[in-house]
Structure formats: structure tokens, C-alpha cells
């Protein structure tokens, strides 16, 4: 139900990345607008992106006050220029969204490698602890600190002149591994958090090769 | 509940090939690594490779690398494993198993097995 | 490759036994080792992971530990349904390698 010139927002969407959070929702208004609720299951709904025309809305803010709860959203749909205008029940028109657990469904962005050093037949490898939004004392959490040992990095490393991919994995953001010694090894990383059934892994990083300008080699 | 099933095991002449099939139900592979592991009869076991769905990323024992490749196909959910250049040392049950972790190697799910029979 | 070395082949126990099988790799594998059981005719299941960690499902009775580059699988109270091939597997580097397997039978 509703007035006849508004229309219930749907395919309400949760996109988000290491935190980063966005609702989408369609259609694209035609002489509507739009303004969205957040609330974890026993709290109060809290309005955000008042009166407005786009068809998404960032809820990043609310989400990383607490990643481990289950949040639900809720989108009103008003008439352009009377917002004050309700449904035929007396309410705005309004559609909920999936609920949504950023801790367990936020997917894990792309990782870059930071570094490597070869020493001899060992490369170190080193993953850049990526920084989110979700905040403590007023500093940035990195995606370590927020999932602590749940995350681990799987490494691929393959000779420049062969196609197999070796593999390693860490709980830290660090791999010693051992390779042939003059050869040219590249690599490619994944986080992946184990015990997810969904959204696992994330992309892989950018392919990083030894004899290029991010890595140091040192022959002991 | 997840699920790993093989098929197209079978007779075949040394030299000869086969595809064996490993659908998978009630997880998606992209999330996660499959494996080949195989048996000979009264054996113990043998990994054979490692696909990871997600980036079509391989690797392959050295006793069947070049004769055997390993794909996926993430529309059907389904890995596959291409037996080239098939030698009597290769008869076994063939299995496909999800990785627990990333691509650590850990085999939290099995299928029930094909068996491979390479014989003239 | 790394070899898993694992001892005895075969063991022969009673129900209620308290069991032990070994797991020697030729180089460090940190706690990179899993245990699984086989049936005669079925697929192995696992049993433990990285190296002490009952899987989910697993009786309490089965334990895994690490020793340096040694490993063992322990069950404590053999039951009837134990009867079975045991291998342990090393996935600290690609590619992962098996025990050659322990077979327990019934005294």
C-alpha cells in the first residue's frame, strides 16, 4: 500500500568491503525520495541519508560501532516535495532489508603485497595489514586486528618459467618460504577466513615477481 | 549438506584417456580449494593436485604432471580431472576432497571415489 | 617432497586398548600435520587437524600431538568401530604427503 505516486523501494543489497558499507536499493526515483533506518536487533532505528534521491546509502558509520552484531535495515519511500505524505495506513511506505553481520559477511578486500626479501633460499613475504574504518580509542583498526587469528593469508608462489602454484598460508601477515636458488619466483596472495561458509576469500592480490622494484634480494 | 560426488572412472587401455567429474552440492567451490587424491588397490594414499576455483590456480604431483590437468567449472559447481597418457601405475580410486582451510592441504570432505582401471 | 614416516604398519588391539601411532617427517612441518581414518571400501574421514585439533563430530577419545617433527595419534579407549587404516598427512608444503598408513585389527 501507499500513495499512488510512490512505490516501495526493493532488492534492498548490503555491499560491503573490509567494512566499508553500503545499502542499495532500486528503483531509481521518479518524484520520490528516499530515507533509510538502521538498528541492530534490540536497539533503536536510527535515520540516515534523509530525503534522498540516490538509490544507495553509506551505513559504514553505524556497522563498525559493533562488526559482530546483526543489523537491519529499512527503506521509506516519500513523495518529491511532501515527505510528510504517508501511506494509506498511516505510515511511509517501507521494505526491509536481509539482515546483515559485518564480522561474518563483509567481504575481504583485495590484498597487496607489501614486500619480499630473498636471503639465500628463503623469501619473506609481507602482506600490507590493511586499515579499515572500524575504529578503538580513536585509532583505525587493521583487518588483523579485527579478526585476530580467524584471518589467514594464503600465498601462491610459482617459478617465472613454470605454471604449478606452490602454496603456503599464514596466521600472521608474513611467509618464509624456501626456493631454488637463481631462480625467479612471483607471488599472489589471498586472505581467507576459514571458518566462514561464505565470502571465504577474497580476490587475488596483484601478481608480484622477483627481479622487480618491490622486492630485495641479499645472496648470504 | 555438502556433498562431493565423483564419476567417469572406468576400463581404459594404457595410453588412453578419461574425465572424471567431482560435483560438489551444498557449498560453492569458488569458496574453497578441491583436491584429487587417489588409492591404488591395497595402497595407501596419493595426491594427485589442487585446483583453487577461484583464480584456476593448479599444481600437480610430479608423477602425473603433464599427463593429467585438473579445471573447474563454477557454473556447474562441478572440478574435473583430465587423465592423459594413462599407465597401468595409475589404476586406483580417485577422489576429490574440499580443503578445510584455504589450500592447506587439510580434507574435511571426501567423495565416494571412481575407480580408475588401466589394463589392455 | 617431505616424507612422512609413520610407524607401526599394523597393530593388532583389543577393545578398550589405549592405542598409539607415530608420525615422523623428514623436516619441520610446524604443526602442519592432520590425522585420518579409512574404512575397507570408503572414503578417509578426517579425525584431527593442525597437528592436535579434534574435527568436529570426532569422539574425545582421539588426540593428536606434536613433538618437535614428531607426531602422534592416540586413542584411548579403542571401541569397536576404530578397526580401520589411520594415515597422517603433512600439508606444510605443496605438495602434501601421506604416511604410508597403520593398519589397527582386533587381537
Known amino acids: 500500500s501507499g500513495t499512488t505516486n510512490t512505490v516501495a523501494a526493493y532488492n534492498l543489497t548490503w555491499k560491503s568491503t573490509n567494512f566499508k558499507t553500503i545499502l542499495e536499493w532500486e528503483p531509481k526515483p521518479v518524484n520520490q525520495v528516499y530515507t533509510v533506518q538502521i538498528s541492530t536487533k534490540s536497539g533503536d532505528w536510527k535515520s540516515k541519508c534523509f530525503y534522498t534521491t540516490d538509490t544507495e546509502c553509506d551505513l559504514t558509520d553505524e556497522i563498525v560501532k559493533d562488526v559482530k552484531q546483526t543489523y537491519l535495515a529499512r527503506v521509506f519511500s516519500y513523495p518529491a516535495g511532501n515527505v510528510e505524505s504517508t501511506g494509506s495506513a498511516g505510515e511511509p511506505l517501507y521494505e526491509n532489508s536481509p539482515e546483515f553481520t559485518p564480522y561474518l559477511e563483509t567481504n575481504l578486500g583485495q590484498p597487496t603485497i607489501q614486500s619480499f626479501e630473498q636471503v639465500g633460499t628463503k623469501v619473506n613475504v609481507t602482506v600490507e595489514d590493511e586499515r579499515t574504518l572500524v575504529r578503538r580509542n580513536n585509532t583505525f583498526l587493521s583487518l588483523r586486528d579485527v579478526f585476530g587469528k580467524d584471518l589467514i593469508y594464503t600465498l601462491y608462489y610459482w617459478k617465472s618459467s613454470s605454471s604449478g602454484k606452490k602454496t603456503a598460508k599464514t596466521n600472521t601477515n608474513e611467509f618464509l618460504i624456501d626456493v631454488d636458488k637463481g631462480e625467479n619466483y612471483c607471488f599472489s596472495v589471498q586472505a581467507v577466513i576459514p571458518s566462514r561458509t561464505v565470502n571465504r576469500k577474497s580476490t587475488d592480490s596483484p601478481v608480484e615477481c622477483m627481479g622487480q622494484e618491490k622486492g630485495e634480494f641479499r645472496e648470504i | 549438506e555438502v556433498q562431493l560426488v565423483e564419476s567417469g572412472g572406468g576400463l581404459v587401455q594404457p595410453g588412453g584417456s578419461l574425465r572424471l567429474s567431482c560435483a560438489a552440492s551444498?557449498?560453492?567451490?569458488?569458496?574453497?580449494?578441491i583436491h584429487w587424491v587417489r588409492q591404488a588397490p591395497g595402497k595407501g594414499l596419493e595426491w594427485v593436485g589442487y585446483?583453487?576455483?577461484?583464480?584456476?590456480?593448479?599444481y600437480y604431483a610430479d608423477s602425473v604432471k603433464g599427463r593429467f590437468t585438473i579445471s573447474a567449472d563454477t557454473s556447474k559447481n562441478t572440478a574435473y580431472l583430465q587423465t592423459n597418457s594413462l599407465r597401468a601405475e595409475d589404476t586406483a580410486v580417485y577422489y576429490c576432497?574440499?580443503?578445510?582451510?584455504?589450500?592447506?592441504?587439510?580434507?574435511?570432505?571426501w567423495g565416494q571415489g571412481t575407480l580408475v582401471t588401466v589394463s589392455s | 617432497d617431505i616424507q612422512m614416516t609413520q610407524s607401526p604398519s599394523s597393530l593388532s588391539a583389543s577393545v578398550g586398548d589405549r592405542v598409539t601411532i607415530t608420525c615422523r617427517a623428514s623436516?619441520?612441518?610446524?604443526?602442519?600435520v592432520a590425522w585420518y581414518q579409512q574404512k575397507p571400501g570408503k572414503a578417509p574421514k578426517l579425525l584431527i587437524y593442525?597437528?592436535?585439533f579434534l574435527y568436529s563430530g570426532v569422539p574425545s577419545r582421539f588426540s593428536g600431538s606434536r613433538s618437535g617433527t614428531d607426531f602422534t595419534l592416540t586413542i584411548s579407549s579403542l571401541q569397536p568401530e576404530d578397526f580401520a587404516t589411520y594415515y597422517c598427512?603433512?600439508?606444510?608444503?605443496?605438495?602434501?604427503?601421506f604416511g604410508q598408513g597403520t593398519k589397527v585389527e582386533i587381537k
Open positions: 576432497a574440499r580443503d578445510i582451510q584455504s589450500v592447506s592441504g587439510e580434507f574435511d570432505y
Open positions: 551444498g557449498f560453492t567451490i569458488s569458496d574453497y580449494v
Open positions: 585446483i583453487d576455483p577461484s583464480n584456476g590456480f593448479t
Open positions: 623436516q619441520d612441518v610446524n604443526t602442519a
Open positions: 593442525s597437528a592436535s
Open positions: 598427512q603433512q600439508h606444510y608444503t605443496t605438495p602434501p604427503t
